[in-house]
Amino acid sequence: REAAPKSYAIRDSRQMVWVLSGNSLIAAPLSRSIKPVTLHLIACRDTEFSDKEKGNMVYLGIKGKDLCLFCAEIQGKPTLQLKEKNIMDLYVEKKAQKPFLFFHNKEGSTSVFQSVSYPGWFIATSTTSGQPIFLTKERGITNNTNFYLDSVE
């Protein structure tokens, strides 16, 4: 039986959700007028880059769109981007597609996503609404790197 990605709405402690704006992800307040993305999450079958202390290796995609999150260096800085790619195409690849991989770790009831390509860099939202989802190596006060994965039907 073929594996299927799990579906989640994603939210931070300030009740900000992820929203698709054009071809990028931004954080916006949970509200009736905003349509949050449903995140697709599926484990990577290849164990080449695995590190159990950092969490499970997963691919992250946007449900209903052929878009996946990936990490690339732009002007010397690790950057989070969306690439046109079906998450199941990544899953069926025998070899792990490193730029698309994230370590998914649980911290209490929250989830943390760390880039496999750039260890120490985490998916984050800023404290300001309408800002892009980004990668940071500074966890804490100004950046939020802990997310709630809410089940959606």
Epitope: A9, A28, P29, L30, S31, I34, S109, T110, D150
Partner: antibody, heavy 122, light 111 residues
Framework: ELQLQESGPGLVKPSETLSLTCTVS??????????WGWIRQPPGKGLEWIGS???????YYNPSLKSRVTISVDTSKNQFSLKLSSVTAADTAVYYC??????????????WGQGTLVTVSS | ESVLTQPPSVSGAPGQRVTISCTGS?????????VHWYQQLPGTAPKLLIY???NRPSGVPDRFSGSKSGTSASLAITGLQAEDEADYYC???????????FGGGTKLTVL
Amino acid sequence: ELQLQESGPGLVKPSETLSLTCTVSGGSITASNYYWGWIRQPPGKGLEWIGSIDYTGSTYYNPSLKSRVTISVDTSKNQFSLKLSSVTAADTAVYYCASGKYYETYLGFDVWGQGTLVTVSS
Amino acid sequence: ESVLTQPPSVSGAPGQRVTISCTGSSSNIGAHYDVHWYQQLPGTAPKLLIYGNDNRPSGVPDRFSGSKSGTSASLAITGLQAEDEADYYCQSYDYSLSGYVFGGGTKLTVL
């Protein structure tokens, strides 16, 4: 249909701890995406949010009360509770429990208990 | 002092239209968090009247409507009736407090 019912002592002595319980019926307290809150209303005054807990067990507290408040869940009894320590006469109020659901009520409270009056007096 | 500001009282004659304002800031209403309105009849618990700025739960008459613009929101009641006499509260979420906030309440008197 979800229903909430507050219970606890109606009289608490100053400096003691106020303890209230909210019993949830018609639904599970661990059901996905629900949040549960405590709100109070001093006699003749407005509503004040005390704090909340959600289905993940995450707690959120009013900064002005944070040092004195603890909210917890008892899944076996389908209840959530409020503890407010070091009470004074200013904590005399009707205490309500309420609930909402992320992605449906959008951080509002659509179900409320009927409220319970707690008086702080020696 | 409440985070959201409402007028303490408003009044109107039966059949008239009244509005109640709710003013917040850039960390709550102005940050695009929704505004919700509650009606509290004397001696009873608050009841959700409007959620998500302008949506009525089932059973709430269409005489009640909500709107939002910038850092403010308002509740309008048309065709005022004696049974509308109550306290009305607005509520939102404030990201700087990581919590829920209420207005101070508005007492509606039907003349």
